[in-house]
């Protein structure tokens, strides 16, 4: 019996087609992805093959103005239109709290939404009961297939699930659900979830009875043969894991942003064992036409977005200096504003010992593309912010050693004075540079804001300590020459859309007046600072 698994993950509100790098589509003839194009390909496969499942491994939420405006209603609507068969909850599905998941998505999806390792307690338990499930048995042709869901255990640190959801260890939670499916005589079981490629592989290895793992969260691109676009494969598709009980378990993921449609064909024997598996992600490029009826629907929903982007979010009573003359040379108040918004967006009081789990922010000055003038009645709109942050990136959470941060700050000024983008703006960090010293040895003081404290204060950076830092995905991926971050990071979780973070902060504050306040200091002559 042959099953075709079509899968997406980490689509992050790319409902419209995008450019090759998943940012805004500029030249339509070269654009990719989007739900209208995805539908064309899915329908083509459904017509050609008998047993097809369309699955999503989480993080449909968050990423473009579509989510900012429609708050998940767009996800339910278009996933229903594409007739997804099942979805696993990702961490970003909790970005607007549990209510922001229940109302727009859980109540409106016409397909099951899954996670076995999220347990509701207290008053939420009855409210959310039955709206998401640990597993689902799906009829496929004359057979049934079991799907078990899972979600990153880190979600409380990455999103806003509130206090009434407990995120359990994935493997511990999945095993009894798989066992339950076995007792129902369901012998073909797919684990569908959102915990990253490393955990996907562990699930394949450790959870008895799982035949296939379809994952997300780490935006992993797998490919067999010559890859069709710019993504470099992390391994073959499918990636085969040998389980502890000696079975070969295919593990797949399909990069992100709806750029590819994962396509995996599995052959099962009559006892539900995998005999063979093969496939590849399908690049959704312009050779695949956009479905006209879905496209028309997208255009109808688009209208509200254009109206939204010119509405006032809040006011500034000071000039927001986002000029390259400032942000690439010294502390600029636009950089301070953005970093403050980044920290504010990551307030998660999950432990009595810590006022917050993260206090530090770094931001490449070159990522700030425009100032905002306060003399326009102080008004700030989404459109204004899109000029400041035009790349459609995310503000991510990483864990780094102090020594890596020190290297990053040395890199920040290694060729100071040439208006290069790597000059870092900061939050929760006080840095002093001596620019008369040789490159690689210019950081003379680096103090960081404590987290395990009731009164936050600045302490010298410790080289061997592990710190959490919020930064643009561009930096986490080694952009602007920050190779040390990419190479040495201990953990990386993708965060919220950059513009969305700043716009939410401005709306919350109503009136803003960020100052230049001595977070970054530099001098050009030898001084009596001692080395740390």
């Amino acid at each position: 019996w042959e099953l075709t698994i079509l899968h997406t993950n980490d689509v992050h509100s790319r409902l419209e087609q995008t450019s090759e790098d998943s940012s805004k589509c500029v030249n339509a003839s070269r654009c990719m992805g989007g739900v209208a194009r995805l539908f064309t390909k899915v329908q083509q496969i459904r017509r050609a093959e008998p047993n097809v499942l369309l699955l999503d491994a989480g993080d449909q939420y968050q990423g473009t103005i579509w989510f900012t405006v429609y708050k998940g209603a767009e996800v339910a609507h278009f996933m229903n239109a594409l007739r997804y068969d099942a979805m696993a909850l990702g961490n970003h599905e909790f970005d607007n709290g549990v209510e922001g998941l229940i109302e727009p998505l859980l109540k409106e999806a016409k397909f099951p939404i899954l996670s076995a390792n999220i347990k509701a307690k207290g008053p939420l338990a009855s409210q959310i009961s039955g709206l998401y499930l640990p597993y689902k048995v799906l009829p496929v042709g004359d057979e049934v297939v079991g799907i078990v869901g899972y979600t990153s255990k880190e979600t409380p640190f990455l999103s806003n699930p509130g206090t009434n959801l407990v995120f359990e260890d994935e493997i511990t939670a999945l095993q009894p659900e798989v066992d339950k499916l076995k007792t129902l005589n369901v012998n073909k079981i797919i684990a569908l979830g959102h915990s990253g490629f490393e955990m996907d592989k562990l699930i394949a290895q450790k959870v008895r009875g799982v035949d296939v793992v379809v994952g997300g969260h780490s935006n992993t691109f797998l490919y067999t043969g010559n890859p069709p676009s710019k993504e470099v494969p992390a391994g073959k598709y499918p990636f085969i894991v040998t389980s502890d009980d000696g079975r070969k378990v295919p593990v797949v993921q399909a990069y992100a942003f709806g750029k590819y449609l994962g396509y995996l064909k599995i052959e099962f024997d009559e006892r539900g064992n995998v005999i063979s598996s093969h496939g590849n992600p399908i690049l959704l490029n312009s050779s695949i036409p956009e479905d006209p009826s879905i496209k028309a629907d997208i255009n109808k929903w688009r209208i509200k977005l254009d109206n939204y982007s010119t509405q006032e979010l809040g006011k500034t009573i000071v000039y927001l200096d986002g000029s390259s003359q400032s942000c690439r040379f010294r502390e600029c108040n636009m950089g301070n504003l953005i970093c403050d918004a980044m920290i504010n967006n990551n307030l998660r009081h999950t432990d009595e010992m810590f006022w917050n789990h993260v206090s530090m922010c770094i931001l490449n000055g070159g990522g700030i593309r425009s100032p905002i003038d306060e003399r326009n009645n102080g008004t700030i709109t989404w459109e204004n912010l899109a000029a400041v942050l035009p790349f459609g990136g995310t503000f991510d959470l990483v864990q780094l050693k102090g020594s890596t941060l020190k290297k990053a700050f040395e890199h920040s000024v290694h060729r100071y004075g040439q208006s290069t983008g790597e000059f870092l703006q900061v939050g929760g960090i006080h840095v002093v540079y001596d620019l008369s010293r040789k490159p690689g040895d210019r950081v003379v003081k680096l103090d960081v804001l404590c987290t395990k404290c009731r009164v936050p204060s600045y302490d010298p950076l410790k080289m061997d300590e592990v710190y959490k830092v919020i930064l643009p995905n561009f930096l986490a991926n080694g952009g602007d020459g920050f190779q040390m971050i990419k190479d040495e990071l201990l953990r990386h979780d993708s965060g919220d859309q950059d513009i969305n973070v700043v716009s939410t902060y401005i709306s919350k504050m109503k009136v803003i007046y960020p100052a230049v306040e001595g977070r970054i200091k530099a001098h050009h002559h030898h001084h009596h600072h001692h080395h740390h």
């Epitope: 068969d85 999806a109 016409k110 099951p112 039955g130 689902k136 799906l138 009829p139 049934v144 369901v186």
Partner: nanobody, 124 residues
Framework: ALQLVESGGGLVQPGGSLRLSCEVS????????IGWFRQAPGKEREGVSC????????YYADSVKGRFTISRDNAKNTVYLQMNSLKPEDTGVYYC?????????????????WGQGTEVTVSS
């Protein structure tokens, strides 16, 4: 929470009719496939009939084809099973069940929510 409550069961003579109702609360009916199942004493639970979420397709077990009709009133959040020409072998506890998805099925394993059941006895 999601709930299904069956009613309309009872004692009926062979050749008689009954209409079972399944009232659904806590969710929008038009998002759910609804199935009727029955369990005779000492036997496995068997699928009798089901109706797709859209109401556009209905399926029946061979044993009831032409005698039973499933229908739904989404406005009243209720699903009905009209049972005509009843036979003694139709005796059992009748359950209604629901699940979200695109493909209606008579396989009990795909149903996530179940009512408590209503008893039907066909006897002279």
């Amino acid at each position: 929470a999601l709930q299904l409550v069956e009613s309309g069961g009872g004692l009926v003579q062979p050749g008689g009719s009954l209409r079972l109702s399944c009232e659904v609360s806590g969710f929008t009916l038009d998002y759910y496939n609804i199935g009727w199942f029955r369990q005779a004493p000492g036997k496995e639970r068997e699928g009798v009939s089901c109706s797709s979420a859209s109401g556009g397709s209905t399926y029946y077990a061979d044993s009831v084809k032409g005698r039973f009709t499933i229908s739904r009133d989404n406005a009243k959040n209720t699903v009905y099973l009209q049972m005509n020409s009843l036979k003694p072998e139709d005796t059992g506890v009748y359950y209604c069940a629901a699940y979200r998805g695109w493909h209606p099925s008579l396989d009990a394993r795909v149903y996530d929510y179940w009512g408590q059941g209503t008893e039907v006895t066909v006897s002279s």
